[in-house]
C-alpha cells in the first residue's frame, strides 16, 4: 500500500494585511476524482481545524462562506490563502490531503508551514 507524500513550504510570512498564501502539493498514488484538503493549526501542542474543502478534480475548491480560507487547485497542487491573520495566529499550519474517491482511500499529512504574523504598527497621528 503506497504512501502519499504531501509537500508544503517550511516558512511563510503573512503580509501586513494579515494574508498568507502557500502551496500544498501531493503526490497522488492513484487517479483521484474527489479530494479533501484540511488546514490545521498547531500551537503549543494544541491542534485546531482552520478550514476544509472537498473538491472534484478540475473544479474549484469551495470553502464555507464564513471561512478565512480561499484556494484554487491545479493538478496535484492546491494554492491556499488564509486571511484575517493577527500576531496571535502565528503557528504551524498543517496541510492534510485525503483522496476520497474512487477507492482506495489515501491520506497524507504535510510537515507544516510555520506562518509568522506581525501586527502592523499603528499609524502615527497626523495633523494633516
Amino acid at each position: 500500500c503506497k504512501a502519499m507524500h504531501v509537500a508544503q513550504p517550511a516558512v511563510v510570512l503573512a503580509s501586513s494585511r494579515g494574508i498568507a498564501s502557500f502551496v500544498c502539493e501531493y503526490a497522488s498514488p492513484g487517479k483521484a476524482t474527489e479530494v479533501r484538503v484540511t488546514v490545521l493549526r498547531q500551537a503549543d501542542s494544541q491542534v485546531t481545524e482552520v478550514c476544509a474543502a472537498t473538491y472534484m478534480m478540475g473544479n474549484e475548491l469551495t470553502f464555507l462562506d464564513d471561512s478565512i480560507c480561499t484556494g484554487t487547485s491545479s493538478g496535484n497542487q492546491v494554492n491556499l490563502t488564509i486571511q484575517g491573520l493577527r500576531a496571535m495566529d502565528t503557528g504551524l499550519y498543517i496541510c492534510k490531503v485525503e483522496l476520497m474517491y474512487p477507492p482506495p482511500y489515501y491520506l497524507g499529512i504535510g510537515n507544516g508551514t510555520q506562518i509568522y504574523v506581525i501586527d502592523p504598527e499603528p499609524c502615527p497621528d497626523s495633523d494633516f
Partner: nanobody, 115 residues
C-alpha cells in the same frame, strides 16, 4: 525510529467480539492520525477506521455500527473494538500511523472468524 506493534488478534466465532491494540513507540508529532487497515486473503489493504490526535474519527462503511475506534494519547496506543464479527471480517489487521511528513505501518495481527 517509530515502531507499531499490534496485538489482540486470534480465532473467534461468528457473532463474537475482539479488541485489537496498537502500541506506538518513538518520537511522534503532537498532531498525528492513527488508523486500522485490513487485508483479506488475496485482496488489497482497505481502510477500516482512523482517529486523529484531536479526536476526529472516520469509519469505512463496512465498519460503521459494529466497530469502534479509540486511542489513548498518553500511552500512544490505538484500539479497535470489533463486535458482531462475521466470516468476511477475516483478515490481517494493520495499524497505520500518519505523522507530519511521514507514515508508518505495523506488522499486522491476524483475525479469523470461523465456527
Amino acid at each position: 525510529e517509530v515502531q507499531l506493534v499490534e496485538s489482540g488478534g486470534g480465532l473467534i466465532q461468528p457473532g463474537g467480539s475482539l479488541r485489537l491494540s496498537c502500541a506506538a513507540s518513538g518520537s511522534i508529532s503532537s498532531y498525528n492520525v492513527m488508523g486500522w487497515y485490513r487485508q483479506a486473503p488475496g485482496q488489497g489493504r482497505d481502510l477500516v477506521s482512523h482517529i486523529a490526535s484531536n479526536g476526529e474519527i472516520m469509519y469505512a462503511d463496512s465498519a460503521k455500527g459494529r466497530f469502534t475506534i479509540s486511542r489513548d494519547n498518553a500511552k500512544k496506543t490505538l484500539y479497535l473494538q470489533m463486535n458482531s464479527l462475521r466470516p468476511e471480517d477475516t483478515a490481517v489487521y494493520y495499524c497505520k500511523l500518519w505523522v507530519l511528513g511521514n507514515d508508518y505501518w505495523g506488522q499486522g495481527t491476524l483475525v479469523t472468524v470461523s465456527s
